[in-house]
């Protein structure tokens, strides 16, 4: 297929990415499912300057983004290396916290009111970022 | 006219394979996620699958995971369904629908179905 | 899976009369709650999305309202065209999930 040249409807445009801001909460994982059925994966940060962009956007408001460890280490959903890559938590955190009394630890990470990250309960209903490559967002994959 | 029609049902033994296509019209088909969606007679409705627009993310109920594939060629304008190792408990009306913009779980536009008989 | 429960499971209505149906939902789904028409041997036809919102060409006497486990659909003034099944659809979560619907009759 031909690549995209401009986002999606009511998608934002920044740095060669497409951004969609929800409005409305979901757990993690159906966050994960939503940015998933647009062809596109929950917010992965790379950089301040994307970490502004977002935060800008979604305002002082609890954001889900596609970082979590879930099955151990921390891990970006579209493979980008975490250890190497940009950071920008809270003070103290992560800290996989199990006072809630939700069962669990904590172990999907969120953009706070002040935009740095903590990790949470994946269960909370919280708003999300979707993303996609603008050179991804219109290839077509093969057909099996 | 906005329109989306199913084929392929049919009778098929206990163990069987048939594959359902669905011929979509009058909309920019690779923009919309598309969902099948089947009712066993006198049931209520049961989503099966659904798959993004470009095809690259499909997404299963548990009891046709393994067993059922969704797919979808946009320069064709047309969804499958291919169903293998096919259960007495699969007969249904199969529906192809088209989800919302942003609302992908609501289908605004349904085929007229396809009968699956699943029987020996 | 999100359960889905409907009620009443049959009613009967005068044309003119004014019904009500509810829907819940096993857990918090905000407002992605759906509701469908279906007529014998015909597909699903949308009326209501995201709870409350009505679909293009739907007519105003249907509406929906709710949020978080307990929706409400609503027929202000019942027309004869209007016997059918109606069901109430999460999309919350996957897998999506549909009740098992509410037929409506004329008395």
């Known amino acids: 297929g031909s690549e995209r040249t401009c986002c999606p409807v009511n998608w934002v445009e920044h740095e060669r990415s497409c951004y969609w801001f929800s409005r409305s909460g979901k757990a993690w994982a159906d966050a994960d499912n939503y940015c998933r059925l647009e062809d596109a994966h929950l917010v992965v940060v790379t950089s301040w300057e994307e970490q502004k962009f977002v935060q800008h956007h979604i305002g002082p408001v609890n954001t889900w983004m596609g970082l979590h460890d879930q099955n151990g280490p921390w891990k970006w959903v579209d493979g980008t290396d975490y250890e190497t890559g940009f950071k920008n938590w809270r003070p103290e955190q992560p800290d996989d916290w199990y006072g809630h009394g939700l069962g669990g630890g904590e172990d999907c990470a969120h953009f706070t009111d002040d935009g740095r990250w903590n990790d949470d309960v994946c269960q909370r209903p919280y708003r999300w970022v979707c993303e996609t490559e603008l050179d991804k967002a219109s290839q077509e994959p093969p057909l099996l | 006219e906005v329109q989306l029609l199913e084929s392929g049902g049919g009778l098929v033994q206990p163990g069987g394979s048939l594959s359902l296509s669905c011929a979509a019209s009058g909309f920019t088909f690779r923009s919309y996620v598309m969902s099948w969606v089947r009712q066993a007679p006198g049931k209520g409705l049961e989503w099966v699958s659904a798959?993004?627009?470009?095809?690259?993310?499909?997404f299963y109920t548990d009891s046709v995971k393994g067993r059922f594939t969704i797919s979808r060629d946009n320069s064709k304008n047309t969804l499958y369904l291919q169903m293998n190792s096919l259960r007495a408990e699969d007969t249904a009306v199969y529906y192809c629908a088209k989800g919302i913009t942003g609302s992908h779980g609501a289908f605004d536009i349904w085929g007229q179905g396809t009968m699956v008989t699943v029987s020996s | 899976d999100i359960q889905m429960t409907q009620s009443p499971s049959s009613l009967s209505a005068s044309v003119g009369d004014r019904v009500t149906i509810t829907c819940q939902a096993s857990?918090?789904?905000?407002?992605?709650l759906n509701w469908y028409q279906q007529k014998p041997g015909k597909a699903p036809k949308l009326l209501i999305y995201d709870a409350s919102n009505l679909e293009t060409g739907v007519p105003s006497r249907f509406s929906g309202s709710g949020s978080g486990t307990d929706f409400t659909f609503t027929i202000s003034c019942v027309h004869p065209e209007d016997i059918a099944t109606y069901l109430c659809q999460q999309y919350d979560n996957l897998p999506f999930t549909f009740g098992p619907g509410t037929t409506v009759d004329i008395k």
């Open positions: 857990r918090d789904i905000t407002f992605y």
């Open positions: 798959i993004s627009g470009r095809g690259s993310n499909t």
